[in-house]
């Protein structure tokens, strides 16, 4: 058993069919010695008496808010949560496996630039009695500070018969050094509590590996006189690191016909303009990637040819 | 470069960009193979990193690019020695068309651009001997290449910025 925060305790349960459970001794936080009784959750029924209460925790019903009382007055509370391990593996029932970029990916994180700011998100089908808390640092043995904001419900989607909820959090490295080569990874730790179930999820990454620029902005087409060709131009996204002479992007451009089956020629360029043949009903698209490190491509920015 | 002269920024830019391409073609499987394990915080200390105080940021380069260039050169020589060691030359043998050979030559080429003949900067010691098991060697190759990708990305940014803003 360990303390998650004041008056909240996590009982680690190594579960197998005939597991004996965990013996937990609760102590009433009071100088009083006599006339103390214990209750569980909202029930008025007395579970036991005395300054300590010993319980055998074997299933979720044994967890909950234990309160000690004297003369009808609550003296102290202890909320017991269960963290379940089965076959040597901690439970991951609360969050959905996003399976990208690999199996057992419960947290996904992205950064728009090298400023040390990043966003992580996760999915669940649970809609109520759910709380999250997030901690982050750079490195684990001698951690450097990362500050995370409040967790927010960022999206709701219907997936077949189920509703899926996306939660996200924004974090910022306290002393980011955008130009340096990262040596220690960022660690993100999410605590999830659903009813009386406690779970924790972690992710470890370098900012450079989670970079995904915003799409290029200001796409413009300028027809060239007496030609089927057009000059297309675009700009770095506002959110990308500066100066651009240092934090450079490379671009992938394509012209997509109306039919999805039509062959698309992709061209790669470091410039922010190109000359292409842009037929009527087609569209021109461009996406960006860090020029020197193969992290994710941005989403496409598109503009119709006509 | 030693003694304060300027490097051939444009040449360095071209070669460092080529290094980035080669480093990724040598080990493209980036997001799909998590090579970080327990204790990696210690093993990453073995390779030289371009750190915050090394003056490789745009402001540091404007003030005095020498600190940064020295750091980059140390790293290039370190990786050049690693790629020439039996970590890469031993079993399992690299494929004949492996980009590691080109990568090795380009590391050497760029380090020489930063130090013309006759000047010798001290460089870091080559790391401890290579592991004996082929599978360990393979894993170490991947780790070295991942680390090299990060190192040459910073070097390439430095030379791109230098070529754009510091060239005479």
């Amino acid at each position: 058993i360990w303390e998650l925060k004041k008056d909240v305790y996590v009982v680690e349960l190594d579960w197998y069919p005939d597991a004996p459970g965990e013996m937990v001794v609760l102590t009433c936080d009071t100088p009083e010695e006599d006339g103390i009784t214990w209750t569980l959750d909202q029930s008025g029924e007395v579970l036991g008496s005395g300054k300590t209460l010993t319980i055998q925790v074997k299933e979720f019903g044994d967890a909950g808010q234990y309160t000690c009382h004297k003369g009808g007055e609550a003296l102290s509370h202890s909320l017991l949560l269960l963290h379940k391990k089965e076959d040597g593996i901690w439970s991951t029932d609360v969050l959905k496996d996003q399976k990208e970029p690999k199996n057992k990916t419960f947290l996904r994180c992205e950064a728009k630039n090298y400023s040390g700011r990043f966003t992580c998100w996760w999915l669940t089908t649970i809609s109520t009695d759910l709380t999250f808390s997030v901690k982050s640092s750079r490195g684990s043995s001698n951690p450097q500070g990362v500050t995370c904001g409040a967790v927010t419900l960022s999206a709701e989607r219907v997936r077949g018969d189920n509703k899926e909820y996306e939660y996200s959090v924004e974090c910022q490295e306290d002393s980011a050094c955008p130009a340096a080569e990262e040596r220690l990874p960022i660690e993100v730790m999410v605590d999830a509590i659903h009813k009386l179930k406690y779970e924790n999820y972690t992710s470890s990454f370098f900012i450079r590996d989670i970079i995904k620029p915003d799409p290029p902005k200001n796409l413009q087409l300028k027809p060239l006189k007496n030609s089927r060709q057009v000059e297309v131009s675009w700009e770095y996204p506002d959110t990308w690191s500066t100066p651009h002479s240092y934090f450079s992007l490379t671009f992938c451009i394509q012209v997509q016909g109306k039919s999805k089956r039509e062959k698309k020629d992709r061209i790669f360029t470091d410039k922010t303009s190109a000359t292409v043949i842009c037929r009527k009903n087609a569209s021109f698209s461009v996406q960006a990637q860090d020029r020197y490190y193969s992290s994710s491509w941005s989403e496409w920015a598109s503009v119709p040819c006509s | 470069v030693p003694g304060g002269s300027s490097p051939a920024w444009a040449q360095c830019q071209q070669l460092s960009q080529k290094l980035c391409t080669l480093a990724w073609s040598a080990h493209p499987l980036v997001g799909h193979m998590d090579l970080r394990e327990e204790g990696d915080e210690e093993t990453t200390n073995d390779v030289p990193h371009i750190q915050c105080g090394d003056g490789c940021d745009p402001q540091g380069l404007r003030d005095n690019s020498q600190f940064c260039l020295q750091r980059i050169r140390q790293g290039l020589i370190f990786y050049e020695k690693l790629l020439g060691s039996d970590i890469f030359t031993g079993e399992p043998s690299l494929l004949p068309d492996s980009p590691v050979g080109q990568l090795h030559a380009s590391l050497l080429g760029l380090s020489q651009l930063l130090q013309p003949e006759g000047h010798h900067w001290e460089t870091q010691q080559i790391p401890s001997p290579s592991p004996s098991q082929p599978w360990q060697r393979l894993l170490l190759r991947f780790k070295i290449l991942r680390s090299l990708q990060a190192f040459v990305a910073v070097a390439a940014r430095v030379f791109a910025h230098g070529a754009a803003t510091l060239s005479p």
């Epitope: 349960l13 579960w15 069919p17 569980l40 959750d41 909202q42 029930s43 029924e45 579970l47 036991g48 319980i55 074997k58 299933e59 979720f60 019903g61 044994d62 909950g64 808010q65 269960l82 379940k84 009695d129 009813k195 009386l196 | -």
Partner: nanobody, 126 residues
Framework: EVQLVESGGGLVQAGGSLRLSCASS????????RGWFRQAPGKEREFVAA??????TYSDSVKGRFTISRDIAKNTVFLQMNSLKSEDTAVYYC?????????????????????WGQGTQVTVSS
């Protein structure tokens, strides 16, 4: 994925006693409460008793006569029935709830339970 098996039913004379057992297997860690319900012919299934950790609750009709208890080590719940009456004749069902209610009285509702046993017949002859 929780299995429940009742035993201990039978024929008993009015005023007599019986002890019912309910053995649970499968993913028993997910259980918040266990209960006993009964169904007499032509009647609705009704609540008898429930237990969660050390908490117990009973229907008014059995209070003081029936006792629900739990053997933690054996994953078994018991219903000790004393002073049996002919109106106690019914099929007795064991149930397990994997939903959490902070108000323990919610476990006296039939729809709070997710898993049910096959039932055991109790007949009280007068």
């Amino acid at each position: 994925e929780v299995q429940l098996v009742e035993s201990g039913g039978g024929l008993v004379q009015a005023g007599g006693s019986l002890r019912l057992s309910c053995a649970s297997s499968g993913r028993t860690f997910s259980i918040y409460a266990r209960g006993w319900f009964r169904q007499a012919p032509g009647k609705e299934r009704e609540f008898v008793a429930a237990i969660r950790s050390g908490l117990t609750t009973y229907s008014d009709s059995v209070k003081g006569r029936f006792t629900i208890s739990r053997d933690i080590a054996k994953n078994t719940v018991f219903l000790q029935m004393n002073s049996l009456k002919s109106e106690d004749t019914a099929v007795y069902y064991c149930a397990a709830a994997v939903n959490y209610f902070t108000d323990f009285t919610d476990y006296s509702k039939r729809d709070s339970y997710d898993y049910w046993g096959q039932g055991t017949q109790v007949t009280v002859s007068s």
